[in-house]
Each structure stands twice: as structure tokens, then as C-alpha cells.
């Protein structure tokens, strides 16, 4: 899987949308995890509702919120009040029993507010970064690589 790079301004919110095949992942919960090192395990941050029919309800862990539109095939993660420590590599996952299929890898980069930094120079900030849910720049996108599970009875 290629990695999507998203940038957000410190102190603002960053919204991540991971799309998936709604039929293939029908009935599966989703999770957002933080990868510990390049080849290390992925530590669960937050997962969607324990009742799949209620996946659209927002679930929160600290400043991270997740909700899943299972009909559209889009799981949305919002990192609120972004901090420098939130920078790093994350994964959107689809859960099936104890197995987790990676839907998307996301590299989160946190930009310091130029107004707070005299040496910021000519750092370009996207126009939408002033919105509460904004401050996201997608530098590269990739189609999700399909990983198939063996059929279950």
C-alpha cells in the first residue's frame, strides 16, 4: 500500500477519510491505529461502534473521533486539537475477528502556526486551514490495494 500524506495545523482539527468497498467490508468494524516504527505493531487508537448497525455513531478516544458510513464505504477519523506529538504513521483498518486488513496508510504531519514562529519564513498554508475541520493537504493519494481473506462458512 502507498502512503497518503496529510498535513494539519497545530491546534486545529485534521479530518482523515478512508474509503473502502462497502460490500466487501460489509459487517466489519473499522479501526484507526498508530504504527510503532516502520515495521512495528499498530497500536489501536479508536475503533467504530461495537454494534455494527450503529457504526455511524461517533466513537471517541481522547481527541480522536471515528465514525463509519457503511453504505457509502467511508470511515472518517477526526484528530482534534492537533499537536506535534500526533505526527506519525497511522492505518485505517477493517476488522474481521482477530484479523485486521489495512485499508489505507496515512502519514500525519503537523505544521506549526507561522504566527507562533518568527522563523517560519514563506511557509505556505492552504486556504481551508482556517476552518475548524480543515488544515488538511493531501500530497499523494493511492487506490487501496486489495487483500483477500479466504472465504468463511
Amino acid at each position: 500500500l502507498n502512503t497518503t500524506v496529510l498535513q494539519g495545523m497545530a491546534g486545529q482539527s485534521l479530518r482523515v477519510s478512508c474509503t473502502y468497498d462497502a460490500l466487501k467490508h460489509w459487517g466489519r468494524r473499522k479501526a484507526w491505529c498508530r504504527q510503532l516504527g516502520e515495521e512495528g505493531p499498530c497500536q489501536r487508537v479508536v475503533s467504530t461502534h461495537g454494534v455494527w448497525l450503529l457504526a455511524f455513531l461517533k466513537k471517541r478516544n481522547g481527541s480522536t473521533v471515528i465514525a463509519d458510513d457503511t453504505l457509502a464505504g467511508t470511515v472518517t477519523i477526526t484528530l482534534k486539537n492537533l499537536q506535534a506529538g500526533d505526527a506519525g504513521l497511522y492505518q485505517c483498518q477493517s476488522l474481521r475477528g482477530r484479523e485486521a486488513e489495512v485499508l489505507q496508510k496515512v502519514l500525519v504531519e503537523v505544521l506549526e502556526d507561522p504566527l507562533d514562529d518568527q522563523d517560519a519564513g514563506d511557509l505556505w498554508v492552504p486556504e481551508e486551514s482556517s476552518s475548524f475541520e480543515g488544515a488538511q493537504v493531501e500530497h499523494s493519494t493511492s487506490r487501496n490495494q486489495e487483500t483477500s481473506f479466504p472465504p468463511t462458512s
Epitope: A22, L23, W26, G27, H49, G50, V51, W52, L53, L54, F56, L57, K58, K59, R60, A67, T70, L71
Partner: antibody
């Protein structure tokens, strides 16, 4: 207004199958903004959620762990109703059984899930 | 399953009293909690959903609060029709569960 009308036998023999039906008026069993539940109540176990069914481009059901191996909830779209089947019953399954609509709060990213409309209840006794 | 523990299991109160019922979850459930009222021989009736939202048609003397593991149902001024059994219910877990109930009786 939305109403749920339950029907089914009040006496079932041990080891047999308990079958109840819940007829919906004023809403659709295929609605994507609701789920359809079975809940039971007994003096020994109190209120116990058994499971629900909902339509999200196709039918999906979820069951309580305690009855997962014995329960089936099915929709009947032609009659706008849904049913409960509980296999291999024992006297411990004696209870008042309710059907209920599980409703979602406001959109988008709706707030909450709750049982807002209930059937009248059916006392089912498991005895030989 | 998540266990829901209500306290007290019963209480005696007079008309006009302020009544508080608590519900504790065995693990954090955010605000995924509802409150119901049940009278003998009747189905439960929804009062409060998502911890603090008053269901349409329910009198404003009923209110709910709490988040995480500790929740409260308050009746600000008890009325004769409020004598009943009250239940909390969580929907965080794949097996939704109810509390054992709190019976509010006339003193």
C-alpha cells in the same frame, strides 16, 4: 403513529422452538433509519436484549452472546413484520418477550440509539 | 458483556421530592446510555437517550447526566404518575445490557 403488534404461542415445550412475530404499522421493516429488536424480561434475569435486524443495502443481524447459538431474527418484507425463533428452549427461557423499534437520533452522525416503540409483550412459558 | 449496576434498588419518596437514581457501567461507555420507565404489566417507556437527551413528549422534570461509567437520572419534583421502576441501558457493547432496575415507591 408507529405501532408494533406481537403474536405467537404462550406455551412452548422444553427442547422445542419458540416462535414469535411482530407486525409493524406506520414504519417499514426495510427502513435504513431503524433496527428491529427482540427483548425479554423475567424476574430472574431482568430485561435482556436478544438481538436486532436492520437493512443496510442488505439485511444484517446482531445477537446477544448469551443466545447467539440458538436465535434467529428474520424480516418478512411482504407482510412488513419480523420474527423471533429461539431453539432448544428450557424453563429458563420463560419470560415476557417484547419486540421494539431501535431508533437513531438526529442526523448527520446521529446521536444515540434507543428503543422508542415497544410491542405489548407476550408471556411465553416453557413447560411440559 | 458490560454490567450495568443501578442504585438504589428501591426507594421511597413523596410527591414533590427530588429523586436521583444512579447507574454505573463496568467499563467506559461514553454517552451510550438510555433510561426507561416501566409500570406493572406495561412495556418500558423511553425517557432519556444518549445519557442526557429528553425524549419527545417526556416531561422536563426528568433529566439525565453523566459520561464514561457513572450516570444519573433525576426527577426534579416527583409526581404521582412517576411511581414506577426505572432502568438504564447501554448500547456500546455488541450485547446491549440493562440495569437491574430501581423501584420508586410512595412513602
Amino acid at each position: 403513529q408507529v405501532q408494533l403488534q406481537q403474536s405467537g404461542p404462550g406455551l412452548v415445550k422444553p427442547s422445542q422452538t419458540l416462535s414469535l412475530t411482530c407486525a409493524i404499522s406506520g414504519d417499514s421493516v426495510s427502513s435504513s433509519s431503524a433496527a428491529w429488536n427482540w427483548i425479554r424480561q423475567s424476574p430472574s434475569r431482568g430485561l435482556e436484549w436478544l438481538g436486532h435486524i436492520g437493512y443496510r443495502s442488505k439485511w444484517y443481524n446482531e445477537y446477544a452472546v448469551s443466545v447467539k447459538s440458538r436465535i434467529t431474527i428474520n424480516p418478512d418484507t411482504s407482510k412488513n413484520q419480523f420474527s423471533l425463533q429461539l431453539n432448544s428452549v428450557t424453563p429458563e427461557d420463560t419470560a415476557v418477550y417484547y419486540c421494539a423499534r431501535g431508533m437513531y437520533g438526529s442526523v448527520p452522525y446521529k446521536e444515540g440509539y434507543y428503543f422508542d416503540i415497544w410491542g405489548q409483550g407476550t408471556l411465553v412459558t416453557v413447560s411440559s | 458483556d458490560i454490567q450495568m449496576t443501578q442504585s438504589p434498588s428501591s426507594l421511597s419518596a413523596s410527591v414533590g421530592d427530588r429523586v436521583t437514581i444512579t447507574c454505573r457501567a463496568s467499563q467506559g461507555i461514553s454517552s451510550d446510555l438510555n433510561w426507561y420507565q416501566q409500570k406493572p404489566g406495561k412495556a418500558p417507556k423511553l425517557l432519556i437517550y444518549a445519557a442526557s437527551n429528553l425524549q419527545s413528549g417526556v416531561p422536563s422534570r426528568f433529566s439525565g447526566s453523566g459520561s464514561g461509567t457513572d450516570f444519573t437520572l433525576t426527577i426534579s419534583s416527583l409526581q404521582p404518575e412517576d411511581f414506577a421502576t426505572y432502568y438504564c441501558q447501554q448500547y456500546t457493547d455488541e450485547s446491549m445490557t440493562f440495569g437491574q432496575g430501581t423501584k420508586v415507591e410512595i412513602k
